[in-house]
Interface confidence: low
């Protein structure tokens, strides 16, 4: 099981389009967050493609990786696993039409509040939110 602080809210698919499409704005922040500690080129390619799918002015939240080493690895694994499940949902919906529950595929829990930048966000960083 993923640690409590590692549980992320990842809304995979949009429910307002037919067929449902990848909810790029919800997924992108997580890939941007794991980008530094993942393979540079592969993650960049995924981000690039997700960027193309995103509507121009859709809002995007900033997410961070946890500072703890174990939690960080779990976090990255969770994101990749969820993204894989997202893609499966997309393929299924394309093949068989939308299924109940697939439109809002997510892992319950709260998003991680730490800043995107900095491995130890409690040390010298401070933040201010733009709404």
């Amino acid at each position: 099981m993923v640690p409590e602080s590692n549980r992320t809210l990842l809304l995979c698919l949009t429910s307002d389009s037919q067929p449902p499409r990848l909810n790029s704005s919800a997924i992108l922040p997580y890939f941007r967050a794991i980008r530094p500690l993942s393979d540079k080129n592969i993650i960049d390619k995924i981000i690039e493609q997700l960027d193309k799918l995103k509507f121009q002015h859709e809002p995007e939240t900033e997410i961070s990786v946890p500072a703890d080493t174990f939690e960080c690895k779990s976090f990255i694994l969770t994101i990749l696993q969820q993204f894989s499940a997202c893609l499966e949902s997309v393929f299924k919906s394309l093949n068989s039409g939308p299924q109940k529950g697939e439109l809002n595929s997510k892992l319950e829990g709260k998003p991680i509040p730490n800043p995107l930048l900095g491995l130890d966000s409690t040390r010298t960083g401070h933040h201010h939110h733009h709404h």
């Epitope: 530094p36 500690l37 960027d51 930048l117 401070h126 733009h130």
Partner: antibody
Framework: EVQLVESGGDLVKPGGSLKLSCAAS????????MSWVRQTPDKRLEWVAT????????YYPDNIKGRFTISRDNAKNTLYLQMSSLKSEDTAMYYC???????????WGQGTSVTVSS | DILLTQSPASLAVSLGQRAIISCKAS??????????MHWYQQKPGQQPKLLIY???NLEAGVPTRFSGSGSRTDFTLNIHPVEEEDAATYFC?????????FGGGTKLEIK
């Protein structure tokens, strides 16, 4: 081609203020964290400030915190550094730097020179 | 703050030979199995240029004669075979924790 062009460097008196700008082009500016790094006259490099890609998070070393403010305008592809209460030890070449994720600085501008002297 | 000590402060290497630059950190700069140590090259009158990121990854466009290794507190930049254009000052930098810090630099001269 990634380009970072700094401007605003000048000669300023101790206690004075200055605002540096960095115009970015050749990449999706809003996708990247950005930093300011300075190089002192004795050629030592010092990290000055970092801002997250959306501008929500800012970071400073203790000797800078409270005096300098990093900010960005993603619509204008521009990074800023507002410097106040300047000291002679702030004399340096200031570089605008693109961040790869949060841990790597992969492209540096040509720099803008700041001299603090009476 | 994490102190980075580079050695030697300067070195002269014959064309085609190997240059080895060391960077020692006052505490571990590894995170999640990755050394968060980076190497930059700066030629006179120019801005620094990223060569190696996260201890051993060669930045795009950087010649393969440059390589990085190390973990925790000890890191090394290797240049082999050294070429004329490699004459520059080399800096290490850690991003394991804030404040990010740099080594004092190593000036490489080609004989």
């Amino acid at each position: 081609e990634v380009q970072l062009v700094e401007s605003g460097g000048d000669l300023v008196k101790p206690g004075g203020s200055l605002k540096l700008s960095c115009a970015a082009s050749g990449f999706s500016f809003s996708n990247y964290g950005m930093s300011w790094v300075r190089q002192t006259p004795d050629k030592r490099l010092e990290w000055v400030a970092t801002i997250s890609y959306g501008g929500s998070y800012t970071y400073y070393p203790d000797n800078i915190k409270g005096r300098f403010t990093i900010s960005r305008d993603n619509a204008k592809n521009t990074l800023y550094l507002q410097m106040s209460s300047l000291k002679s030890e702030d004399t340096a070449m200031y570089y605008c730097v693109r961040g790869y994720g949060y841990d790597t600085m992969d492209y540096w501008g040509q720099g803008t020179s700041v001299t603090v002297s009476s | 703050d994490i102190l980075l000590t580079q050695s030697p402060a300067s070195l002269a290497v014959s064309l085609g030979q190997r240059a080895i630059i060391s960077c020692k950190a006052s505490q571990s700069v590894s995170f999640a199995g990755t050394g968060l140590m980076h190497w930059y090259q700066q030629k006179p009158g120019q801005q620094p240029k990223l060569l190696i990121y996260r201890a051993s990854n060669l930045e795009a466009g950087v010649p393969t004669r440059f390589s990085g290794s190390g973990s925790r507190t000890d890191f090394t930049l290797n240049i082999h075979p050294v070429e004329e254009e490699d004459a520059a000052t080399y800096f290490c930098q850690q991003s394991r924790e804030y404040p990010w810090t740099f080594g004092g630099g190593t000036k490489l001269e080609i004989k």
